[in-house]
């Protein structure tokens, strides 16, 4: 955010950038936390936009019975790595096709075993404040799927009639590893020493992270004419003088007409 | 990549004999390799299956007729098919699996590598 400033009096603001604003030859330049002339004012919003998708990933195991491990699998540019590649791809593809997060799997290992193929599956999911349900949700299913292809599809009198062959019991679940993104932790830590008066809302599935000072929302402060200011001690309204009132308060709800104290005056003198 | 190009397709009457040959741009040795066929408006379906190690599958349709065969050195694989029918009448096309492509003497596993075909009409 920055503020441009005109004449002889720039050069006095620019020893006054406050905040660690930092002067540019016209203006302050002002951290992401502050705006203003100086750099003197608390920004009533941060941005901290989510992601458009949250991923996970999980680190499974199975034993493919169809194929007969060579060495040559262990090298991934190799003609047999590459096709195994291919139809295990296509395997996957075809038991996860129900799974809307699903995004694809990758191989990270073959070894001997008949053939265990150590592979990620991929999930994606469009960011909502459900995201980790819904990714929940999909890694179950996956479980659900990979056990029921590798209980079905096996070798029966030394046959594979399926696309693949699995050993039922080399099917394993390592690992699952989900994005973490906490809309409320990243608020805290942007807002830093002001982050106890920052809060999350959401709007359309969107978190905003305001201060009481940003209008709209559920915790926005009402300053009637003033104006909400953020400080250390979190945040205040400033109260307006017009030309006829003198307004105070807490939310400078309580106006004072300015006759009727100048006339008081008057009457004493 | 294996390229698959089949040849000695034609027109034959009831009762006669046809031989099919694939020729592969690959090695098919470490390979299944399989023939599939495809009569206008139906299915594809398997057709005969030979493994790495020789032993063959037939189609119920087609046991007693047809003999599938593979010579490793040539990269070839046949189809002699005897005593042909109407019923014959198809697009036939060779199919080779994975490298190292174990179990599978029946014909229902999908090979990664297919041909363009080659037409066999039994007709009088």
């Known amino acids: 955010r920055t503020t441009t400033c005109f004449g002889d009096g720039c050069q006095n603001t620019a020893s006054r950038c406050k905040n660690g604003g930092t002067w540019d030859g016209l203006k302050c330049q002002c951290p992401n936390l502050y705006y203003g002339e100086l750099c003197e004012e608390v920004v009533s919003s941060i941005d901290i936009g989510p992601p458009e998708t949250i991923s996970a990933q999980m680190e499974l195991t199975v034993t493919v019975t169809s194929v007969k491990f060579t060495e040559e699998l262990k090298n991934h540019s190799s003609q047999e790595f590459q096709e195994f590649k291919q139809t295990f791809t296509e395997q996957m593809n075809i038991v996860y096709s129900g799974i809307p997060e699903y995004v694809g799997v990758n191989i990270t290992k073959l070894r001997l075993g008949s053939v265990v193929v150590e592979h990620d599956v991929l999930l994606r999911t469009k960011y909502t404040p459900e995201y980790k349900t819904v990714l929940d949700n999909a890694t179950e299913v996956v479980k659900e799927k990979i056990t029921k292809v590798t209980t079905q599809q096996i070798m029966i009198n030394d046959i594979c009639s399926d696309m693949m062959c699995f050993n039922t019991t080399g099917t394993q679940v390592q690992n699952i590893t989900v994005t973490q993104y906490d809309p409320e932790e990243d608020c805290r830590k942007m807002a830093k020493e002001y982050g106890d008066y920052f809060v999350v809302e959401y709007r359309d599935q969107k978190p905003y992270c305001i201060s009481p000072c940003e209008p709209g929302f559920s915790v926005s402060k009402n300053c009637n004419l003033g104006k909400c200011q953020m400080s250390l001690s979190g945040p205040q309204c400033l109260c307006v003088t017009t030309e006829t009132h003198w307004y105070s308060g807490e939310t400078c709800n309580q106006g004072t007409q300015k006759s009727l104290v100048y006339g008081h005056h008057h009457h004493h003198h | 990549e294996v390229q698959l190009v089949e040849s000695g397709g034609g027109l034959v009457q009831p009762g006669r004999s046809l031989r099919l040959s694939c020729a592969a741009s690959g090695d098919i040795t470490r390979r299944c390799m399989g023939w599939f066929r495809q009569a206008p408006g139906k299915e594809r379906e398997g057709v005969a299956g030979i493994s790495e190690d020789g032993i063959t599958g037939y189609a119920d349709s087609v046991k007693g007729r047809f003999t599938i065969s593979k010579d490793n050195a040539k990269n070839s694989l046949y189809l002699q098919m005897n005593s042909l029918r109407a019923e014959d009448t198809a697009l036939y096309s060779c199919?080779?699996?994975?490298?190292?492509?174990?179990?599978?003497?029946?014909?229902?596993?999908?090979?990664?590598?297919r041909g363009q075909g080659t037409m066999v009409t039994v007709s009088s």
């Open positions: 199919a080779a699996s994975i490298l190292n492509r174990v179990g599978c003497r029946q014909l229902s596993y999908e090979y990664i590598y």
